[in-house]
């Protein structure tokens, strides 16, 4: 806290300008009117104030706006944003995407800080949903942003926003998140033709159910092994050898290298060995010929 002291004669600031660089902290506190600072906030970033001087300017704004800064001030914070705490930011009401972008630019190249996370949270909650432009902006600054959201939060993403998502934005998503995003992607891309559809839907397939994988197997999509390995195990298990062969096309040979890893390992255990042998890959571990397979889950459902 800076002590309240009277402003020395002739030092009262008439505008925010370079002369303030030479003011001591107590002089800034005493001689700069907070309302003047708020109206000329855009100048602060053009002046090489010390971090200590910036602390004083922030303190003045906090006193002027105890309920939170107005957007007219927020949009010109610049590097003063880095001095804000999450508690400060929770009081804000940021509605303009331009303001959000301007503040994210200041933090560019750094990890998502608690301040930025709070800012984004306030902004998205204020909008009510994660619209395409917002998602575009957030994933441009933080490619992992989407995967940092809970499935509940992801449910507010409208299907139209899915067009903004790039494959790398989904790299760190877990199956629960993809379960939410996949149906939205399916809806968003529904009017595309086969090959274009597959290119777009591919990165979301970790949330696809068995019936959709079966449908894809009929479309000569040639899914690569990396995508196949990210599929839900429970969605892969019911696929027949013929369906997996059609789904992977020329990439089917890659199954051999992955035979000890899920979901390939679990899928092999569910197939008849003679069906696996038709692939000619030397996959082992299938159900021996002559054995009867009982689907206990079906039996439980019937009883």
């Amino acid at each position: 806290e800076v002590e309240k002291t009277a402003c020395p004669s002739g030092k009262k600031a008439r505008e925010i300008d370079e002369s303030l660089i030479f003011y001591k902290k107590w002089e800034l506190e005493a001689c700069v009117d907070a309302a003047l600072l708020a109206t000329q906030m855009d100048r602060v970033n053009a002046i090489p104030f010390t971090y200590e001087q910036l602390d004083v300017l922030k303190h003045k704004l906090d006193e002027l706006y105890p309920q939170g800064y107005p957007e007219s001030v927020i949009q010109h914070l610049g590097y003063l944003f880095l001095k804000m705490s999450p508690e400060d930011i929770r009081k804000w009401n940021v509605t303009s995407l331009e303001t959000l972008k301007a503040l994210l630019e200041v933090n560019k190249g750094h990890e998502m800080s608690p301040q930025v996370a709070t800012l984004i949270d306030r902004f998205v909650k204020g909008r009510g949903q994660l619209d395409k432009d917002t998602l575009d902006t957030l994933t441009a600054f933080y490619p992992g942003y989407l995967c940092s959201l809970s499935p509940e939060e992801l449910s507010s993403v409208p299907p139209s926003s899915i067009w903004a998502v790039r494959p790398q934005d989904l790299d760190t998503c877990d199956p629960r998140q993809l379960d939410v995003l996949y149906p939205k992607a399916r809806l968003a891309f529904q009017n595309m033709n086969g090959s274009e559809y597959f290119v777009k839907i591919q990165s979301f397939l970790g949330g696809a159910p068995t019936e959709d994988l079966k449908a894809l197997s009929q479309q000569n999509v040639s899914m690569d092994l990396a995508t196949f390995m990210k599929l839900r195990t429970d969605a892969v298990l019911p696929l027949t050898v013929a369906e997996v062969q059609k789904l992977l096309g020329p990439h089917v040979e890659g199954l051999k290298a992955e035979e000890r890893h899920r979901p390939v390992r679990d899928w092999i255990l569910r197939q008849r060995q003679d069906d696996l042998d038709t692939l000619g890959l030397g996959l082992q571990g299938g159900i021996p010929n002559g054995y009867l397979v009982l689907d206990l889950s079906m039996q439980e459902a019937l009883s």
């Epitope: 970033n45 002046i47 610049g78 590097y79 972008k101 301007a102």
Partner: nanobody
């Protein structure tokens, strides 16, 4: 993403003038304080001038009185008018976004002043 592309540098006689330009993309130009810095070989980068989003300008000590910074928010362009150039003004001139504490930099444009 962010691109700051400087132009207008070159070789000029002592006492001559140059006008540098910087076209910005990938930033909210109208909300950013912008600036010009310079760096001569073996020297630290130094602030030449900055300009607030509203157009108010701050000039560093290095070229004060011989430079004018301006901006056109409609064209996302920053300018630096340099007059009465001296050989010691020879340096790489960099456009920056963020004002006195930049968050983004251009690649620079070389200014050489011959005596």
């Amino acid at each position: 993403q962010v691109q700051l592309v400087e132009s207008g540098g070159g070789l000029v006689q002592a006492g001559g003038s140059l006008r540098l330009s910087c076209v910005a993309s990938g930033i909210v130009f109208r909300l950013n304080a912008m600036g010009w810095f310079r760096q001569a070989p073996g020297r630290e980068r130094e602030l030449v001038a900055t300009i607030a989003s509203g157009g108010w300008a701050y000039y560093g000590d290095t070229m004060s009185g011989r430079v004018t910074i301006s901006r056109d928010n409609d064209k996302n362009t920053l300018y630096l008018e340099m007059n009465s150039l001296k050989p010691e003004d020879s340096a790489m001139y960099y456009c920056s976004a963020g004002g006195a504490r930049p968050h983004s930099w251009g690649q620079g444009t070389q200014v050489t002043v011959s005596s």
